[in-house]
Interface confidence: low
């Protein structure tokens, strides 16, 4: 199977992505997310589907989720705001905004993240950076630690073969290659960033991870801007 | 080296419940799933459930619904299954197992007969 | 409910032949299947996951394949050691649910 971290990824330098969160469920890590705003969180609304009767808040400034480091901190949530087109079923619109309790105190491990804007699809081959504490293999062990993986973006029409997704890939998402290095259970929500962008939030639709016919769908926050703008607003 | 220890053998009255164990060495539970099947005598596997050792989570398929309860003790690493109102149909080997797209590891099995 | 079904419940073949197990799943599972070895009064092993990828340790004689509702095993060059019930399981990508085939006993002739 699959070695390393992500899959086939590997153990990310400790708080070089300022921008990286935890979403957690009753003191465990659920899913990711990305600090795009001082009082806001992205990540999938599909994660609030496991979260309806406990307690969700968001980490911040973490390398492992175990140990004391001197940046982490715990925020209660205000305020969750799925995209009001998100349904269980799909895939499509699987974009959750969470409001922090309090403004992040922000520092060289706690940032916001610049979010891609123009809505223009990232040219295929393009290497893309996704990070996340889910499934590090197959046997489904998962870090303490922070695991990140490059993945090359995929062309939507490569995306959409029937071996593929099979046309289920619209305008609003986006593909990265998959073959044996992928994101997977648990970096759900958790950012695509291409350079230096955050071009795609990882989508927790199922699908078998690292496998190359069934590449990586991420949703791409450029459409989604008016919305992320309204709720920020 | 990764092993899954069961309990021994146990032989049971109809109506009455059993508990087994699944002792995990090797490697920590809260890092995995762990499952539980059923194999009757000359027959074929069935799964009953999973138990996500770190939160406590379960998922049952709906034939073991009311039926099974897994449970798990991490401080012993431990992995549980409970069957209660017992009857013939429960005599079987139960296999306690570790993984999430595949069962990668396997205990050796617990046999449980219910006889009057 | 998804139901695996392997139509052969036997099958029978020679040292050095080349033999194929099925299981036809009851709607899509994309490549959510995994194959399993059970030899006589032992604990099943685990061969194949994700339709395709071997378990590390397994001998590349087996090969898994399929897609959507039909999943073949195949070991080519059957040596003796192979003689043993073969079952194919699917599962869910959520919930994680999971359902395994009837069996296909292998016998060497």
């Known amino acids: 199977p699959p070695r390393g971290r992500i899959l086939g990824g590997r153990e990310a330098e400790a708080h070089a992505r300022p921008y990286m969160a935890s979403v957690q469920l009753n003191g465990a890590h659920l899913c990711g997310g990305v600090l795009v705003a001082e009082q806001w969180v992205l990540s999938a609304a599909h994660c609030l589907e496991d979260a309806a009767d406990g307690k969700v808040q968001v980490l911040l400034g973490a390398h492992s989720l175990s140990q004391p480091e001197p940046s982490k901190r715990l925020y209660d949530v205000l305020r969750a705001v799925p995209h009001p087109d998100s349904q269980p079923d799909t895939i499509d619109h699987d974009l959750l905004l969470l409001q922090l309790s309090e403004k992040a105190t922000l520092g060289p491990a706690v940032r916001p993240l610049p979010w891609q804007r123009v809505d223009r699809d990232v040219a295929p081959g393009t290497l893309c950076d996704v990070a996340g504490w889910g499934i590090v293999n197959h046997a489904g062990r998962r870090p303490d630690s922070l695991q990140h993986v490059l993945l090359p973006v995929l062309d939507r029409a490569t995306c959409n073969r029937r071996t593929h997704h099979d046309g289920a890939i619209t305008e609003r998402l986006m593909c990265a290659e998959s073959n044996r290095r992928d994101s997977c259970k648990g970096d759900s929500g958790g950012p695509l960033v291409c350079g230096g962008v955050l071009e795609g939030v990882v989508t927790s639709g199922s699908r078998v991870c690292g496998n190359r016919k069934k590449p990586g769908i991420y949703t791409r926050v450029a459409s989604y801007a008016a919305w992320i703008d309204s709720v920020l607003a | 080296e990764v092993q899954l220890q069961q309990s021994g053998a146990e032989l049971v009255r109809p109506g009455a419940l059993v508990k087994l164990s699944c002792k995990a060495s090797g490697f920590n539970i809260k890092d995995y799933y762990m499952h539980w099947v059923k194999q009757r005598p000359e027959q074929g596997l069935e799964w009953i459930g999973w138990?996500?050792?770190?939160?406590?989570?379960?998922i049952y398929d709906p034939r073991f619904q009311g039926k099974a309860t897994i449970t798990a003790d991490t401080s012993s690493n431990t992995a549980y299954l409970q069957l209660s109102s017992l009857t013939s149909e429960d005599t079987a080997v139960y296999y306690c197992?570790?993984?999430?797209?595949?069962?990668?590891?396997w205990g050796q099995g617990t046999l449980v007969t219910v006889s009057a | 409910d998804i139901v695996m079904t392997q139509s052969q419940k036997f099958m029978s073949t020679s040292v050095g032949d080349r033999v194929s197990v099925t299981c036809k799943a009851s709607q899509n599972v994309g490549t959510n299947v995994a194959w399993y070895q059970q030899k006589p009064g032992q604990s099943p092993k685990a061969l194949i996951y994700t339709a395709s990828y071997r378990y590390s340790g397994v001998p590349d004689r087996f090969t898994g394949s399929g897609s959507g509702t039909d999943f073949t095993l195949t070991i080519s060059n059957v040596q003796s050691e192979d003689l043993a019930e073969y079952f194919c399981q699917q599962y869910n990508s959520y919930p994680h649910m999971y359902t395994f085939g009837g069996g296909t006993k292998l016998e060497i002739k």
């Open positions: 138990i996500d050792p770190e939160n406590g989570h379960t």
């Open positions: 197992s570790r993984g999430l797209l595949g069962f990668a590891y």
